[in-house]
């Protein structure tokens, strides 16, 4: 297999070095000589020629492959020109020569992937692998190549990439950029707890890679899809050379699928305790898992330890909505959160769903609004509430809905950010039905939107009562 | 053309030494090649005793116990075989032949026969 | 030492028959093998080398195959001046050895 790595080498005889500090050279001969025909004479400046041991491997329909493993270490040498030639024991010929460098033929042996497992974010895959010489692991640049591991489809499409050693995992991404805040301030945000649509960039094959030593993580897959994937590295070309080793053992790992298939949502009400919920699944149980992490990248050899969610009690709320499964834990403002849903089927598969990474301030969900109103004129209300968190009143968005009596649609309002009431024009004589919540939505605390307050019943009067 | 020619005495005594030359014409010994010395019994088995290369490394056959040694005169052209304390049983037609490009022996002298006796 | 095994020391043969004399190694020789022929009062003269490679002079009515460890010299349509014996050496492993020898008679 490595004889095909070097296949751009036009050199008869042709050399590799594993980790250099060792090297192989071989060459092939047509013809049918001898045993011990040839001598691999090698040489550095000023020295003595030298034999090295050679073994031959018969290859059929082609001759004999002679091979020579330099037997000492102290025979190479980085840096100085060395020179090899392939004697004819028997006949006065000199069959090749050549001078080289050792340090310019390296071939390194694969990197042997130790881990393969699902990273932070629904669509990440975070690998490590250990490098056969560590000693010369900073001198290398690595490979991966990848793709979807199908039953039906084995020529599925393959991602080859340069794993980038400058930096190391993405820093996660709080949600509210300076430019989210530009958009109408209750604008739906894509987090953790969000179980609208999926935002996906227009293409989730193009992948991104970083890597930090033995460990990399691949981000923009497919949730729930399983991958298979392989490494291989080459001197990085500035201390060393060489050409590109073979790719290692392929390993296959099953990505969890992204929670939010489950509607999973995530809230804090104290900056304390968090509450997950997620849709029960039909014939099957489910557990809620999380983890706390400080790191801001790649974490290298250390895999999440997650811990059981505290199970609640199913809930019902309504006829209409579907069933939820619920879980809290106790945690901390300074790292991290990560949510892990297993769900197991009947029959004893487990399925797990990674929810998107997010900071306790990022998830803290409003106690339900008090909607207060008095009638000025026919129609004409003047609505008031309360902040349910007077701490965060400028960062307290509101959103109101109403409805004619019998009528099922609503009409939905935004107050502006900060807001502590308004006014409504509504038609004089009818019957409506208001509801008010809020969220937050600032540079401080986000989060998702409280429950609607109870029904306020509103009959306007007619037009000559005020 | 090459041509190789064995000489030597026809007769020796238990114990003593066989001393055979091989005269080479028609081309160097230094120049290439590998000078090899072949004998055939009796009964014609065929045994491969040993060569001197054009750079006169030399190499045996262990069965012969290291009772033998080929050497060479470059001057004259000539390779040499001797082999030690001789019993009857090397009695023998010995042949000199030369070990060409295909690693076989591409030329040979007409050999010349060997009896050990007292 | 690698043995090398002619199964017959002689043939009665006819002219104008196909001969195939047989020769096997003790262990793999990677074609290392030659064929000589050798008849009476003369030095062998080599036929084949490399098991299947003719020598320049040799008549195209021998031929040579084989490989690992079982070899075999054909002569398809025999002349009277091929009577003599033929010996097999094997060059892969010293000290190269030859067979016992086959000895073709009319």
């Known amino acids: 297999q490595d004889v095909s790595l070097l296949a751009s080498d036009s050199e008869p005889l042709k050399c590799f070095s594993r980790t250099f500090e060792d090297l192989t050279c071989f060459w092939d001969e047509e013809e049918a000589a001898p045993s011990g025909t040839y001598q691999l004479l090698y040489a550095y400046p000023r020295e003595k020629p030298r034999a090295c041991p050679l073994s031959s491997q018969s290859m059929p329909h082609f001759g004999t492959r002679y091979v020579c493993q330099f037997p000492d270490q102290e025979e190479v040498r980085l840096f100085f020109p060395l020179h090899l030639w392939v004697k004819n024991v028997f006949l006065n010929q000199t069959r090749t020569q050549r001078v080289l460098f050792v340090d310019s033929v390296g071939l390194p042996a694969p990197p042997s992937i130790i881990k393969a497992m699902g990273g932070s974010q629904p669509g990440e895959l975070q690998i490590s692998w250990e490098e056969p010489a560590p000693e010369i692991s900073d001198f290398l640049r690595y490979e991966l190549r990848y793709g979807p591991r199908d039953p039906k489809n084995s020529t599925g499409p393959t991602v080859i990439q340069l794993i980038a050693t400058e930096t190391c995992c993405p820093a996660l991404q709080r949600p509210h950029s300076a430019s989210a805040l530009d958009q109408s301030p209750c604008a739906q945000p894509t987090m953790p707890w969000q179980d609208g649509p999926k935002q996906t960039s227009p293409s989730r094959e193009a992948s991104a890679l970083t890597a930090e030593g033995g460990s990399c993580l691949i981000s923009g897959l497919q949730p729930g899809n399983s991958y298979w994937l392989q490494l291989r590295s080459e001197p990085d070309g500035i201390s060393l050379g060489g050409s590109w080793g073979s790719w290692s053992l392929p390993v296959t790992v099953d990505l969890p699928g992204d929670a939010v298939a489950l509607g999973l949502q995530c809230f804090t009400l104290d900056l304390k305790n968090v509450t997950c919920q997620w849709q029960q699944q039909d014939h099957a149980s489910s557990q809620g898992f999380f983890y706390h992490s400080r790191a801001r990248c790649c974490p290298r050899d250390r895999y999440p330890i997650w811990e059981n969610c505290e199970e609640e009690e199913k809930t019902n709320p309504g006829l209409q909505t579907p069933q939820f499964s619920r879980c809290h834990f106790k945690s901390r403002n300074d790292s991290i959160i990560h949510i892990l849903v297993e769900v197991t089927t009947a029959p004893g598969t487990v399925h797990s769903y990674l929810g998107s990474p997010f900071w306790i301030h990022q998830a803290v969900r409003l106690p339900t609004p008090n909607l207060h109103w008095r009638e000025i004129s026919s129609g004409h209300l003047e609505l008031e509430w309360q902040h349910p968190s007077s701490w965060a009143a400028q960062e307290t968005c509101y959103q109101l809905r109403y409805t004619g009596e019998g009528h099922q649609d609503w009409k939905v309002l935004e107050p502006p950010l900060g807001a502590r009431g308004g006014t409504l024009e509504l038609r004089p004589r009818s019957r409506y039905r208001l509801q008010l919540r809020a969220r937050l939505n600032g540079p401080t605390y986000q989060g998702p939107w409280s429950s609607w307050s109870d029904p306020t019943r509103v009959e306007t009067a007619t037009e000559t009562a005020w | 053309d090459v041509q190789l020619q064995e000489s030597g005495p026809g007769l020796v005594k238990p114990s003593q030494s066989l001393s055979l030359t091989c005269t080479v014409t028609?081309?160097?010994?230094?120049?290439?090649?590998?000078w090899n010395w072949i004998r055939q019994f009796p009964g014609n088995k065929l045994e491969w005793m040993g060569y001197?290369?054009?750079?006169?490394?030399?190499s045996y056959n262990p069965s012969l116990k290291s009772r033998n040694s080929i050497t060479r005169d470059t001057s004259k052209n000539q390779f040499f075989l001797q082999l030690n304390s001789v019993t009857t049983e090397d009695t023998a037609t010995y042949y000199c032949?030369?070990?060409?490009?295909?690693?076989?022996?591409?030329?040979w002298g007409q050999g010349t026969s060997v009896t050990v006796s007292s | 030492d690698i043995q090398m095994t002619q199964s017959s020391s002689s043939f009665s043969v006819s002219l104008g028959d196909r001969v195939t004399i047989t020769c096997m190694a003790s262990?793999?020789?990677?074609?290392?093998l030659a064929w000589y022929q050798q008849k009476p009062g003369n030095a062998p003269r080599l036929l084949i080398s490399?098991?299947?490679s003719l020598e320049t002079g040799v008549p195209s009515r021998f031929s040579g195959s084989g490989s690992g460890k079982d070899y075999t010299l054909s002569i398809t349509s025999l002349q009277t001046e091929d009577v003599g014996t033929y010996y097999c050496?094997?060059?892969?492993?010293?000290?190269?050895?030859f067979g016992g020898g086959t000895k073709l008679e009319i």
């Open positions: 032949a030369r070990l060409g490009r295909r690693y076989t022996m591409d030329y």
């Open positions: 028609g081309y160097s010994i230094t120049s290439d090649y590998t």
């Open positions: 001197i290369t054009y750079s006169g490394s030399t």
């Open positions: 262990e793999d020789i990677y074609i290392r």
């Open positions: 490399a098991a299947t």
């Open positions: 050496q094997q060059y892969w492993s010293s000290p190269w050895t």
